[in-house]
């Protein structure tokens, strides 16, 4: 058993038929010695008396909020949560496996630049009795600080017959060094509580691997005289690291016809302009990627040819 | 070529070669489809590689103040990786494919290190750890780890030279 936060405890249980469970001793936080009784939130009966209560925690019926009372007055609470381990594997019932970039990916994270700020998100189909808390650090043996905000519900979408809820959190490395080569990964730890079930999820990454620039901005077309060609120009996104002579991007310019089946013309360039042929009803799109490290491409910025 | 004693390197040549190194490092080990190498306990294998750290002066301000600290650090790393790519980790079994970019990568590392430090001028170089994996699969894993680490290193080096070429060239 260990303390998650004040008055909230996690009991780790090997989950198999007829498992012996874990003996837990609860102590009432009071100077009182006599006349103390104990109750469990989901049951109306008195469980025991005295300053301490010993319980055998085997299943969810044994978890919950234990309260000690004296003469109708509440003295203190202890909330017991269960963390299930089956066949040596901790349960992952609360979050949805996003399966990208690989199986058992519950947390996904992205950064728009090298400032040490990043966002992580996760998915669940659960909407009630659900809480999250997030911690992060750089490295684990001698951790350096990363500050995370509160997890918030960032999107709600319908997937088939079901609703899916996306939660996200923003974190910032306390002493970020954008120009350095990372040697220790960022560790992100999410504590998830659904009803009386506790689970934890972790992700480990280098900022450089989760970089995804915002799309290029101010995408413009300038027709060239007596030609079907146009000069496409754009700018670095505002959120990208500066100076751009140091933190450089490379770009992919695509001409795409109305039909998805039409051949796409693609040009790669390090400049912020390119000359392409603009076909009728086509659109021109540009996306960006770190010039020197192959992390994710940005989403496309697009303009119609007409 | 760099001139010993604090003169500027040939920023533009270094920029071109370092950008080529980035391309080669990624073609030698594309990210897609490989295992997450950080899960494979890399502390003991790749923690000894030289990293370009916060105090090494490789940020834009540090380069403006005195680029020599950073260039020395980059040179150390280039020599280190050049030696690793020439070691039995890469030359032993399983053999690399004939058209593997590792050979070009090895030559380019050497080329950039020589641009930074001509013959007769010596910066101290870092000791190469003795990594001699016995099993072919260990060697394969180590190759992946070294190449992943090299990708990060050459990205920083390329940024340094790009910035130098744009702002510090005579």
């Amino acid at each position: 058993i260990w303390e998650l936060k004040k008055d909230v405890y996690v009991v780790e249980l090997d989950w198999y038929p007829d498992a012996p469970g874990e003996m837990v001793v609860l102590t009432c936080d009071t100077p009182e010695e006599d006349g103390i009784t104990w109750t469990l939130d989901q049951s109306s009966e008195v469980l025991g008396s005295g300053k301490t209560l010993t319980i055998q925690v085997k299943e969810f019926g044994d978890a919950g909020q234990y309260t000690c009372h004296k003469g109708g007055e509440v003295l203190s609470h202890s909330l017991l949560l269960l963390h299930k381990k089956e066949d040596g594997i901790w349960s992952t019932d609360i979050l949805k496996d996003q399966k990208e970039p690989k199986n058992k990916t519950f947390l996904r994270c992205e950064a728009k630049n090298y400032s040490g700020r990043f966002t992580c998100w996760w998915l669940t189909t659960i909407s009630t009795d659900l809480t999250f808390s997030v911690k992060s650090s750089r490295g684990s043996s001698d951790p350096q600080g990363v500050t995370c905000g509160a997890a918030t519900l960032s999107a709600e979408r319908v997937r088939g017959d079901n609703k899916e809820y996306e939660y996200s959190v923003e974190c910032q490395e306390d002493s970020a060094c954008p120009a350095a080569e990372e040697s220790l990964p960022i560790e992100v730890m999410v504590d998830a509580v659904h009803k009386l079930k506790y689970e934890n999820y972790t992700s480990s990454f280098f900022i450089r691997d989760i970089i995804k620039p915002d799309p290029p901005k101010n995408l413009q077309l300038k027709p060239l005289k007596n030609s079907r060609q146009v000069e496409v120009s754009w700018e670095y996104p505002d959120t990208w690291s500066t100076p751009h002579s140091y933190f450089s991007l490379t770009f992919c310019v695509q001409v795409q016809g109305k039909s998805k089946r039409e051949k796409k013309d693609r040009v790669f360039t390090d400049k912020t302009s390119a000359t392409v042929i603009c076909r009728k009803n086509a659109s021109i799109s540009v996306r960006a990627q770190d010039r020197y490290y192959s992390s994710s491409w940005s989403e496309w910025a697009s303009v119609p040819c007409s | 070529r760099a001139v010993p004693g604090g003169s500027s390197p040939a920023w533009t040549q270094c920029q071109q070669l370092s950008q080529k190194l980035c391309t080669l490092a990624w073609s030698a080990h594309p990210l897609v489809g490989h295992m997450d190498l950080r899960e494979e306990g890399d502390e003991e294998t790749t923690n000894d590689v030289p990293h370009i750290q916060c105090g090494d002066g490789c940020d834009p301000q540090g380069l403006r103040d005195n680029s020599q600290f950073c260039l020395q650090r980059i040179h150390q790393g280039l020599i280190f990786y050049e030696k690793l790519l020439g070691s039995d980790i890469f030359t032993g079994e399983p053999s690399l494919l004939p058209d593997s970019p590792v050979g070009q990568l090895h030559a380019s590392l050497l080329g950039l290190s020589q641009l930074l430090q001509p013959e007769g001028h010596h910066w101290e170089t870092q000791q190469i750890p003795s990594l001699s994996p016995s099993q072919p699969w260990q060697r394969l894993l180590l190759r992946f780890k070294i190449l992943r680490s090299l990708q990060a290193f050459v990205a920083v080096a390329a940024r340094v030279f790009a910035h130098g070429a744009a702002t510090l060239s005579p």
Partner: antibody, heavy 121, light 107 residues
Amino acid sequence: QIQLVQSGPELKKPGETVKISCKASGYTFTNYGMNWVKQAPGKGLKWMGWINTYTGEPTYADDFKGRFAFSLETSASTAYLQINNFKNEDTATYFCARSLSTMITTTFAYWGQGTLVTVSS
Amino acid sequence: SIVMTQTPKFLLVSAGDRVTITCKASQSVSNDVAWYQQKPGQSPKLLIYYASNRYTGVPDRFTGSGYGTDFTFTISTVQAEDLAVYFCQQDYSSPYTFGGGTKLEIK
């Protein structure tokens, strides 16, 4: 002991409004969520939604968004269900049901006796 | 929404028999399943929560089991007062849905 006592049966014309009450006793009203469940004659149970008795925030199941409203009178430990523009298909017994615990909102440990609301045509 | 398919719809048994009702969820609901008993003319009563935990005061002849999508409710020795409709309910994901019910009749 814990009790949920609901208001009596109602006979309503189509288009009218009905407001059912559910008075709680024997526990701290604001500690536990209050759910509403519909049971059409001879049919199964359908969860309508719940109201957070501490914040007053209601949550409605998709089928009960629009004409249905949950509300509270905390000082009287009472929850209300209002149905506007009453329709034939609203004829049912409506139950209020208290959550099992502060941590388990949508398992129902205590139920009101039910209020039958019938449409009169 | 998650569909809870409960079988059988009707059960005609004798006192002393063992009865098993099953509930199948259309997707995994972990162990977030409750079972209720509704006697004629009464409101439902909670018997089992978290798939296998008997609620306070519920006789130990009532048991529940299951995880994921398949859940079972058992009355080990049926008694005359067990005449009722039994419902399963998933309380994993909103909207929290009930099975269609199983009507237990005593011969």
